[in-house]
């Protein structure tokens, strides 16, 4: 009876996600057969989050909208380890929007999920950010410094990275 009700709950939760994520990839968390964590197929997973590299070229606003219709946000990078994971799936000759912007052009950077902007956990390329008209952040590759962040005009179409919390069933 307990197993039956757990299965019913799982099915109803899966139905919630079906519109945008018809297929989920789930792994068993820990030793308990009851606890599964899932990411939409073909998203990748790291710690408690799922990531998707969007290859369509869009402005920052539309990139964020694209993520949001999938139940995600543009990526918020909280640690060096997280960035190191993300860059494994990026192409060196492309740039990708992050969920970081400076809407007023006053160098008050803010993350889309309201995570406080911590200057100590940022990975700007040297000399960046450097232009008040460039109010959105990308991650890109520079041969001299490897992967890092750069400010860019928000209307210039780029690829992007979406991030969402893992789905627990």
């Amino acid at each position: 009876n307990f197993m039956y009700s757990k299965t019913v709950k799982r099915l109803s939760k899966l139905r919630e996600y079906q519109q945008y994520h018809p297929s989920l990839t789930c792994v068993m968390e820990g030793k308990d057969i009851e606890d599964w964590s899932c990411c939409p197929t073909p998203w990748t997973s790291f710690q408690s989050s799922c990531y998707f590299i969007s290859t369509g070229m869009q402005s920052w606003t539309k990139s964020q909208k694209n993520c949001s219709v999938m139940g995600a946000d543009l990526v918020v990078i909280n640690t060096r380890e997280e960035q190191d994971f993300i860059i494994q799936n990026l192409k060196r000759n492309s740039s990708y929007f992050l969920g970081l912007s400076d809407p007023g052009g006053r160098r008050h950077w803010q993350w889309v999920d309201q995570t406080p902007y911590n200057e100590n956990v940022t990975f700007w390329h040297s000399g960046e950010p450097n232009n008040l008209d460039e109010r959105c952040a990308i991650i890109n590759f520079r041969s001299s410094e490897e992967w890092g962040w750069n400010d860019i005009h928000c209307h210039v179409p780029q690829k992007s990275i979406c991030k969402m919390k893992k789905i627990y069933i």
Partner: antibody, heavy 118, light 107 residues
Framework: QVQLVQSGAEVKKPGASVKVSCKAS????????IHWVRQAPGQGLEWMGT????????SYNQKFKGRVTMTRDTSTSTVYMELSSLRSEDTAVYYC???????????WGQGTLVTVSS | DIQMTQSPSSLSASVGDRVTITCRAS??????LAWYQQKPGKAPKLLLY???TLAIGVPSRFSGSGSGTDYTLTISSLQPEDFATYYC?????????FGGGTKVEIK
């Protein structure tokens, strides 16, 4: 007032290149991105690509990739669109357009007719 | 790439008529749609953006509606200066494709 003034009409032979200019005035040149759109005679409109004058970042329509190059000269507030390996089907009016704060084309140049003929 | 299909390609109407032009996208463009008016030998002029927001200086007889993949431009009472060609354009992702155009002619 905002103005985009384009260079004059050009006649080119197949295989040649053409460089069309678009001089901006009436606003801060480096604050808005510029797009290029073309229109063949009696036909519809076709988006070619965009350039951010502040840093020169570009994004091109794949259809023209390898043939189109967009550049800018901040000292004269001018953007350029160069199309190479011209063929007769490139005969068109070429427009530059500014993308406004609302992310739509709010101002357009007057257009430049490029004729490709042997 | 998202394709934009505009219909009709041409129509004949009289001054005072109500005119409707439709634009269908091959995918959801989330209301990121503009409508332009173009007269012979001139550059296009922005009429509406975000599917339904009137651009500055555009008369209120022009209106737009729609969502998802289907959008409409309506001219409530056609005026002599409205005879022109109308284009839709999406701005969801590149390439920012245009519809094929609708020529509005005098009946």
């Amino acid at each position: 007032q905002v103005q985009l003034v384009q260079s004059g009409a050009e006649v080119k032979k197949p295989g040649a290149s053409v460089k069309v200019s678009c001089k901006a005035s009436g606003y801060t040149f480096t604050s808005y991105i510029i797009h290029w759109v073309r229109q063949a005679p009696g036909q519809g409109l076709e988006w070619m690509g965009t350039i951010y004058p502040g840093r020169g970042d570009t994004s091109y329509n794949q259809k023209f990739k390898g043939r189109v190059t967009m550049t800018r000269d901040t000292s004269t507030s001018t953007v350029y669109m160069e199309l190479s390996s011209l063929r007769s089907e490139d005969t068109a009016v070429y427009y530059c357009a500014r993308m406004g704060d609302n992310e739509y084309f709010d101002y357009w140049g007057q257009g430049t007719l490029v004729t490709v003929s042997s | 790439d998202i394709q934009m299909t505009q219909s009709p390609s041409s129509l004949s109407a009289s001054v005072g008529d109500r005119v409707t032009i439709t634009c269908r996208a091959s995918g959801n463009i989330h209301n990121y749609l503009a409508w332009y008016q173009q007269k012979p030998g001139k550059a296009p002029k922005l009429l509406l953006y975000d599917a339904e927001t009137l651009a500055i200086g555009v008369p209120s007889r022009f209106s737009g509606s729609g969502s998802g993949t289907d959008y409409t431009l309506t001219i409530s009472s056609l005026q002599p200066e409205d005879f022109a060609t109308y284009y839709c354009q999406h701005f969801w992702s590149t390439p920012y494709t245009f519809g094929g155009g609708t020529k509005v002619e005098i009946k």
